[in-house]
């Protein structure tokens, strides 16, 4: 079938980077500037993606492949092919409808993106808290109290966590 089609359809001979120009007796014409065709046999070339505003060019458009964008510093990509850019927050914060907000007490975020997550509940695994959690870090769970045999050197308990307050932005 493919061979029959190629005999009947001269456009199938047009390689990537060209289009089958109906205005010129179906001659294979190069894609115009700022356009591309990534497969052969195309009757049109696609417009190149433009990386503007918060987007910056990661890979230039060529006659055979679209441009690729990423985000300007202070933002990170969301969606397939970096279709959106989302503002970074600081560690210990999450992006809300009102901007970057500190994680509530009992939650943390160790990245510049994403949401604040609850501290691990060590007691669910029968363990004790070895290091207290912060807005930026999860708690560290230690051995269960039963694992500490009499006379064994115990870990000095960490200082009590300070009362959470809004740190200066």
């Amino acid at each position: 079938f493919e061979r029959t089609r190629s005999l009947q359809d001269p456009c199938s001979n047009c390689p990537a980077g060209t289009f089958c120009d109906n205005n010129r007796n179906q001659i294979c014409s190069p894609c115009p500037p700022n356009s591309f065709s990534s497969a052969g046999g195309q009757r049109t070339c696609d417009i190149c993606r433009q990386c503007k505003g918060v987007f910056r060019t990661r890979k230039e458009c060529s006659s055979t492949s679209n441009a690729e964008c990423d985000c300007t510093p202070g933002f990170h990509c969301l969606g397939a092919g970096c279709s959106m850019c989302e503002q970074d927050c600081k560690q210990g914060q999450e992006l809300t409808k009102k901007g970057c907000k500190d994680c509530c007490f009992g939650t943390f975020n160790d990245q510049k993106r994403g949401i604040c997550r609850p501290w691990t509940n060590c007691s669910l695994d029968g363990k004790s808290v070895l290091v207290n959690g912060t807005k930026e870090r999860d708690v560290v769970c230690g051995p269960s109290p039963a694992d500490l045999s009499p006379g064994a050197s115990s870990v000095t308990p960490p200082a009590p966590a300070r009362e959470p307050g809004h740190s200066p932005q």
């Epitope: 993606r49 990386c51 503007k52 505003g53 918060v54 987007f55 964008c69 933002f75 969301l78 969606g79 970096c82 279709s83 959106m84 850019c85 989302e86 503002q87 992006l95 809300t96 409808k97 009102k98 901007g99 970057c100």
Partner: nanobody
Framework: EVQLLESGGGLVQPGGSLRLSCAAS????????MSWARQAPGKGLEWVSG???????YYTESVKDRFTISRDNSKNTLYLQMNSLRAEDTAVYYC????????????????WGQGTLVTVSS
Amino acid sequence: EVQLLESGGGLVQPGGSLRLSCAASGFTFSSSAMSWARQAPGKGLEWVSGIYSGGSTYYTESVKDRFTISRDNSKNTLYLQMNSLRAEDTAVYYCAKWGTLRFGVWAEYDHWGQGTLVTVSS
């Protein structure tokens, strides 16, 4: 073709005020959410403020209570009233169509102006 043209930037002393304007054309301004962003010298872009078509407004923490975003749909114009300006507000300010309606998020189909420079210095 969508066009956004900012104006109103300039040199102002700390504590002073400026009003930026963004003239929009080529799309239905009244039903579009709009936003302002800024880029300080040598720094990354920062989301500043946004306004929904219905008038709900959003601000980043550092400009809250000092900046006011507004719109005049009859003039297809977006505004940013900036009061109590500080040296750290020095930046190129951009007007942008805001299709995602999400704080701090823009999409590839959103359009941007060329920017206007605001310098706060004594």
